[in-house]
Interface confidence: medium
């Protein structure tokens, strides 16, 4: 399944959702041996008055919270994105065409946020 | 000046945008001796492809932008937030109306990226 | 023509082990990579490790039980399953991806292995 993105209104709470990402669909198969792709996750979701615990929200996303419940129109909600990301490694060409083996950094989403 | 954050439809790239916070405007002054407020800053504007060096944007994202474009319906663009943030001092009254000097932490956006 | 033999395969008791190989036979330019996958009856082809001069890669659900190595000098890759569960029990296939090519051009005829609990 491509991902689970709630475009109505009512959006719900700040969360991390499925998505798997194929290489082949992003074109990356010439460069990329294995894997074929991966569980990447995603941050999507509403970061409203008031944060919860669990929405791992840092200070300024509270702060920036109460201001924007003040003034909507000028200061935005705080905005949900990962909290924490994994590796992945990755057996790819270079470009002199010798296979390599890589630890790809924040490739995958562990947690989400409000920040 | 509260910010100035762009509801229009054409927004522009993820930026650091000014905003000072006025503790009395959240209704902190009973409880903040000082300071009166603070220069917090806010992230906003657009993640769109492709995303530049200076949008400090993870490999998560960069790979999302992608999917994005696939599936739009199905999966948000990244969202722009802080990708460092810095502490100040407050002094303040305890529950016991003791003077406490403290640090906070990440109240302050010193930058924001793609995430 | 590339011709992939895959051998090995057979009935062992859970926590036992097997040893697959994957022979690959004919006008071969090279090959880059051999990939082995697996399919459980009603379910979708899984990928099990890539073995590559570069290094070998593997999938979650056999990371440190399984060994992927290869042998050049008899264009043949080996695949040891040691700790195999009741869950690893599918068709696997071997398949070779050659210099240029930008996926597997090849596959095996895949050989069967059963974990019995």
């Known amino acids: 399944s491509v991902g689970d993105y709630n475009t109505s209104e009512q959006k719900q709470a700040c969360k991390k959702h499925e998505l798997y990402v194929s290489f082949r669909d992003l074109g990356w198969q010439d460069w990329i041996i294995a894997p074929e792709g991966y569980a990447a996750f995603y941050c999507d979701g509403e970061c409203s008055f008031p944060l919860n615990a669990h929405m791992n929200a840092t200070n300024h996303a509270i702060v920036q919270t109460l201001v924007h419940l003040m003034f909507p129109d000028h200061v935005p909600k705080p905005c949900c994105a990962p909290t924490k990301l994994n590796a992945i490694s990755v057996l790819y060409f270079d470009d002199s065409s010798n296979v390599i083996l890589k630890k790809y950094r924040n490739m995958v989403v562990r947690s989400c946020g409000c920040h | 000046s509260v910010g100035d954050y762009n509801t229009s439809e054409q927004k522009q790239a993820c930026k650091k945008h000014e905003l000072y916070v006025s503790f009395r405007d959240l209704g902190w002054q009973d409880w903040i001796i000082a300071p009166e407020g603070y220069a917090a800053f806010y992230c906003d504007g657009e993640c769109s492809f492709p995303l530049n060096a200076h949008m400090n944007a993870t490999n998560h994202a960069i790979v999302q932008t992608l999917v994005h474009l696939m599936f739009p319906d199905h999966v948000p663009k990244p969202c722009c937030a802080p990708t460092k943030l810095n502490a100040i001092s407050v002094l303040y009254f305890d529950d016991s109306s003791n003077v406490i000097l403290k640090k906070y932490r990440n109240m302050v956006v010193r930058s924001c990226g793609c995430h | 023509e590339v011709q992939l033999v895959e051998s090995g395969g057979g009935l062992v008791q859970a926590g036992g082990s097997l040893r697959l190989s994957c022979a690959a036979s004919?006008?071969?330019?090279?090959?880059?990579?051999m990939a082995w996958y697996r399919q459980a009856p009603g379910k979708q082809r899984e990928w099990v490790a890539t073995v590559t001069n570069g290094g070998t890669l593997y999938g979650d659900s056999v990371k440190g039980r399984f060994t992927g190595s290869r042998d050049n000098a008899k264009n043949t890759v080996y695949l040891q399953m040691n700790s195999l569960k009741p869950e690893d029990t599918a068709v696997y296939y071997c398949?070779?991806?050659?210099?240029?090519?930008?996926?597997?051009?090849?596959w095996g005829q895949g050989t069967q292995v059963t974990v019995s609990s």
């Open positions: 398949a070779l991806r050659q210099i240029g090519a930008s996926g597997y051009d090849y």
């Open positions: 004919g006008s071969i330019r090279g090959f880059v990579a």
